[in-house]
C-alpha cells in the first residue's frame, strides 16, 4: 500500500467552443481506495475552483457547461489523487478552448452522378457544415476532407477540399458502387470523426436526363 501515482490529464476537447471536457488517466491507486478531484484557475485570477460536473462525460472526466466555458481565458487545470497514504498532483495543463475544438462531422451528405457536355461522368459530392458551428459569422473557419472507395477496394482515396462544401470526383469506374464520407476541422482544432457513410453506384450506361 502506497500513496497514489501521479495522474495525467490526457485530453481536452470542445465540440463548439461553448462547452468542453477534460479526461485524465488515474495512475496507480497504491492498492487503496483513491479519490480524484479536478481543480482549475483562470489566467489572471487567484481563485481556484473544483470541477463543476464529474458525471456528464463519464469516468475520470470533467465537463464544463456553457456557464463555465470562456474562450477569452486560459484554464490552468490540475487533477489531484488522494488516498489514506497520501496524495499526488498532475502537471498543470494550460487550456485555450479555441485550440481544443473537435466538431461534429459535416451533415446532409448528398451524392449525385452528373455528366459533362463531352459525356464525361463525375460524382458530385455536397454537404453542409455541422449544425452547431456558426460558420457564416466567421466564428468558425472550417476545412473539409472527403474520402471515397469502391466497395471492393481496401484503401480510401482522400481529397482535401479546403473551405468548399462540394467536390467533383472524376475517373470513376462505371458499374462500381462507391462509399463516401466527409469530415471537417476548424482553423485551430482537430479533425472530426468521419461522418455517416453514403453510397452510390456509377451507372454503366449513364445518359443525361433533361
Amino acid at each position: 500500500q502506497s500513496p497514489p501515482g501521479k495522474p495525467e490529464i490526457h485530453k481536452c476537447r470542445s465540440p463548439d467552443k461553448e462547452t468542453f471536457t477534460c479526461w485524465w488517466n488515474p495512475g496507480s491507486d497504491g492498492g487503496l481506495p483513491t479519490n480524484y478531484s479536478l481543480t482549475y484557475s483562470k489566467e489572471g485570477e487567484k481563485n481556484t475552483y473544483e470541477c463543476p460536473d464529474y458525471k456528464t462525460s463519464g469516468p475520470n472526466s470533467c465537463f464544463f457547461s456553457k456557464q463555465y466555458t470562456s474562450i477569452w481565458k486560459i484554464y490552468i487545470i490540475t487533477v489531484n489523487a488522494t488516498n489514506e497514504m497520501g496524495s499526488s498532483t498532475s502537471d498543470p495543463l494550460y487550456v485555450d478552448v479555441t485550440y481544443i475544438v473537435e466538431p461534429e462531422p459535416p451533415r446532409n451528405l448528398t451524392l449525385e452522378v452528373k455528366q459533362l457536355k463531352d459525356k464525361k461522368t463525375y460524382l458530385w459530392v455536397k454537404w453542409l457544415p455541422p449544425t452547431i458551428t456558426d460558420v457564416k459569422t466567421g466564428w468558425f473557419t472550417m476545412e473539409y476532407e472527403i474520402r471515397l472507395k469502391s466497395e471492393e477496394a481496401d484503401e480510401w482515396e482522400i481529397h482535401f477540399t479546403g473551405h468548399q462544401t462540394q467536390f467533383k470526383v472524376f475517373d470513376l469506374y462505371p458499374g462500381q458502387k462507391y462509399l463516401v464520407q466527409t469530415r471537417c476541422k476548424p482553423d485551430h482544432g482537430y479533425w472530426s470523426r468521419w461522418g455517416q457513410e453514403k453510397s452510390i453506384e456509377i451507372p454503366n450506361d449513364f445518359t443525361l436526363k433533361d
Partner: antibody, heavy 118, light 112 residues
C-alpha cells in the same frame, strides 16, 4: 514528468539529408501537437511547423516547405523531422517543442545541433 | 509573415535596477477570438528557451513576480522590476496569432 529527448549533435555533408528524432515521455503522445523550431548560432528562433501525432496532420511554415518533413511513430512516442538537400544555411540547433492546449511552447527538447560541413 | 522587432539588441543594467524590453509587431496581434497571443521566452546559453509570460501579461507557472508583461495591438513590453544576476540572459518575444508563428531577434540583458 514531461520530457522531450533529442540527440545532441549530427554532422552531415552538404547535399545530403538528415532525420532528427524527438522521443517524448511522461504524457500521452497522441494528445498534443509537436512543433519544431530552428535556431542558427547567435540568432533568433524560427518556427518550422507542427504535427498532430493523433493523425499526422501537419502545418508548415511556407519557408520550410520542401526542406522539412514532419512525421511521427506513435508506437515509440517519437516525432521526426527530415531535412533534405542540406546546405550551410541549415546548420543550426533544431528543437522539438510541445504546447499544452494552447499556442505557445510549454516544454522543449534540449535541441540537436546540425552541422553541415564537407 | 508578421515581423517582430525587439529593442534594444543588448541592454546593460545594474543589479537591482529595472529593465525594460520592447517588442513591436508589423501587424496587430489581436486574434479573431479577441485574444492577443504575444509571449516572452528566456534562454540561457546552451539551453532551450523557457516560457516566461503568455498572452501579453500572464506569468507562467513558477516565474517570479518581478517579471511583468504589458501592451496591446502592436506594442508590447517586458519589465523586470529588480534585476538579479540569474536574469542576465537572452529574451525573445513571440507571436502566435498569425501563422507562421514568429519570434523577435532577441535582447541580451547584461551587466553595466
Amino acid at each position: 514528468q514531461v520530457q522531450l529527448q533529442q540527440p545532441g549533435a549530427e554532422l552531415v555533408r552538404p547535399g545530403t539529408s538528415v532525420k532528427l528524432s524527438c522521443k517524448a515521455s511522461g504524457y500521452t503522445f497522441t494528445s498534443f501537437w509537436m512543433h519544431w523550431v530552428k535556431q542558427r548560432p547567435g540568432q533568433g528562433l524560427e518556427w518550422i511547423g507542427v504535427i498532430d501525432p493523433s493523425d499526422s496532420h501537419t502545418n508548415y511554415n511556407q519557408k520550410f516547405k520542401g526542406k522539412a518533413t514532419l512525421t511521427v511513430n506513435t508506437s515509440s512516442s517519437t516525432a521526426y523531422m527530415h531535412l533534405s538537400s542540406l546546405t550551410s544555411e541549415d546548420s543550426a540547433v533544431y528543437y522539438c517543442a510541445r504546447g499544452d492546449y494552447s499556442n505557445w511552447f510549454t516544454y522543449w527538447g534540449q535541441g540537436t545541433l546540425v552541422t553541415v560541413s564537407a | 509573415d508578421v515581423v517582430m522587432t525587439q529593442t534594444p539588441f543588448s541592454l546593460p543594467v545594474s543589479l537591482g535596477d529595472q529593465a525594460s524590453i520592447s517588442c513591436r509587431s508589423s501587424q496587430s496581434l489581436v486574434h479573431s477570438n479577441g485574444n492577443t497571443y504575444l509571449h516572452w521566452y528566456l534562454q540561457k546559453p546552451g539551453q532551450s528557451p523557457k516560457l516566461l509570460i503568455y498572452k501579453v501579461s500572464n506569468r507562467f507557472s513558477g516565474v517570479p513576480d518581478r517579471f511583468s508583461g504589458s501592451g496591446s495591438g502592436t506594442d508590447f513590453t517586458l519589465k523586470i522590476s529588480r534585476v538579479e544576476a540569474e536574469d542576465l540572459e537572452l529574451y525573445f518575444c513571440s507571436q502566435s496569432t498569425h501563422v507562421p508563428w514568429t519570434f523577435g531577434g532577441g535582447t541580451k540583458l547584461e551587466i553595466k
